[in-house]
């Protein structure tokens, strides 16, 4: 037996740096969707009521506690009748997989904020991206959320050579040794060591000395 007409399927969490959207299929015809997400009291909260979209932004809910394991479901109603039910007296619905933001949100592509050379040392700073996770009415950065559980790996190489080197930090700054008079290029990657999946981000865009972001001091 296939999926009944109107019932959602392929429910998928799409989440990067805690910005979290639930997606599903199919595109509706003559019916609408309503999403419910279970809160920490295991109550179902309504979101995206009566939508004809196949996605629902649940960021506002999951950022309340990023360590909580959430479950959502997509309810299907015939168009114009939010009270319509299936044969069992309930609307057709499909459950999502469980989702724990802290463990599962993808790490977004990091950005090198700046680099500064002083003699034979270069300080490379990674932008501490703001997330939508709040504490005391302020938005937390990625570092605020993950603390020492977030590592950045730096790849760097002389512009004139292909041999790369690497360094790591559990802050957002690197201090590396360079050869005087040489230009270097840099790229960073974020890692959550404690994870077993979704551990690494994509590499940041490459930034090279002699371009805008750098500063040089003798």
């Amino acid at each position: 037996a296939g999926t009944p007409p109107g019932k959602a399927f392929n429910l998928t969490w799409i989440s990067t740096d805690f910005k979290t959207i639930l997606e599903w299929q199919p595109k509706p015809t003559n019916y609408t969707y309503t999403v419910q997400i279970s809160d920490r009291s295991r109550n179902w909260k309504y979101k995206c009521t009566g939508t004809t979209d196949t996605e629902c932004d649940l960021t506002d809910e999951i950022v309340k506690d990023v360590n909580w394991t959430y479950e959502a479901r997509v309810l299907s109603y015939p168009a114009g009748n939010v009270e319509s039910t299936g044969s069992a007296g309930e609307p057709l619905y499909e459950n999502s997989p469980e989702f724990t933001p802290y463990l599962e949100t993808n790490l977004g592509q990091p950005t090198i904020q700046s680099f500064e050379q002083v003699g034979t040392k270069v300080n490379v700073t990674v932008e501490d991206e703001r997330t939508l996770v709040r504490r005391n009415n302020t938005f937390l950065s990625l570092r605020d959320v993950f603390g020492k559980d977030l590592i950045y790996t730096l790849y760097y190489w002389k512009s004139s050579s292909s041999g790369k080197k690497t360094a790591k930090t559990n802050t957002n700054e690197f201090l590396i040794d360079v050869d005087k008079g040489e230009n270097y290029c840099f790229s960073v990657q974020a890692v959550i060591p404690s994870r077993t999946v979704n551990r690494k981000s994509t590499d940041s865009p490459v930034e090279c000395m002699g371009q805008e972001k750098g500063e040089f001091r003798e």
């Epitope: 590592i151 790996t153 077993t196 999946v197 551990r199």
Partner: antibody
Framework: QVQLVESGGGVVQPGRSLRLSCKAS????????MHWVRQAPGKGLEWIGL????????IYDPKFQGRFTISADNSKNTLFLQMDSLRPEDTAVYYC??????????WGQGTPVTVSS | DIQMTQSPSSLSASVGDRVTITCKAS??????LNWYQQKPGKAPKLLIY???SLADGVPSRFSGSGSGTDYTFTISSLQPEDIATYYC?????????FGQGTKLEIT
């Protein structure tokens, strides 16, 4: 469970090449950094280099750069070490290891390589 | 490149003794230092990571301390099964470097 199994070692003549493999199971190599480390008979551990299998980034100890090449086949969940222009001093047990970014948490059993005429 | 100087290269101690091994880095390695135990014919086994953190399943008689360039590994009460060679590894920047190793024997 997580396992790393090296293969491809053996006896080879100086100047020849050898390709070692490290088959991973219980995890996807693309989620981790992967390393090769070697140990000559009666000597200490020596780091060769690493790869990020997801993007192909490789880093080597300069003494191995150009002569040794690390690669990965994500579809086969396997790491490789291509060793060219082998010398007697390359005789060692070669280990692959998984890196969680704070430590090497799993190692293979090692595969011995002997370079001799 | 960062050099790791490990000492002593060998030491002999009695069961129950407190044993200390040191590793000195040629520059600040910001606690990116691990300690491994290796027994003959076996792969290294992680004991301590990030200079001071005990790896899962490792007995509490093993400990690590230090920061900057100076690091210490301690076995508080030596057991017969601790006979092995011990290595430090810095992984703060490439090339990663191991100490020369300390061969531990029981008198």
């Amino acid at each position: 469970q997580v396992q790393l199994v090296e293969s491809g070692g053996g006896v080879v003549q100086p100047g020849r090449s050898l390709r070692l493999s490290c088959k991973a199971s219980g995890f996807n190599i693309k989620d981790y950094y992967m390393h090769w480390v070697r140990q000559a008979p009666g000597k200490g551990l020596e780091w060769i280099g690493l790869i990020d299998p997801e993007n192909g980034n490789t880093i080597y100890d300069p003494k191995f750069q150009g002569r040794f090449t690390i690669s990965a086949d994500n579809s086969k969940n396997t790491l490789f070490l291509q060793m060219d222009s082998l010398r007697p001093e390359d005789t060692a047990v070669y280990y692959c290891a998984r890196d969680n970014s704070y430590y090497f948490d799993y190692w293979g059993q090692g595969t011995p390589v002997t370079v001799s005429s | 490149d960062i050099q790791m100087t490990q000492s002593p290269s060998s030491l002999s101690a009695s069961v129950g003794d407190r044993v200390t091994i040191t590793c000195k880095a040629s520059q600040d390695i910001r606690k990116y230092l691990n300690w491994y135990q290796q027994k003959p014919g076996k792969a290294p086994k992680l004991l301590i990571y990030y200079a001071t953190s005990l790896a899962d399943g490792v007995p509490s008689r093993f400990s690590g301390s230090g920061s900057g360039t100076d690091y210490t590994f301690t076995i508080s009460s030596l057991q017969p099964e601790d006979i092995a060679t011990y290595y430090c590894l810095q992984h703060g920047e490439s090339p990663y470097t191991f100490g020369q190793g300390t061969k531990l024997e029981i008198t």
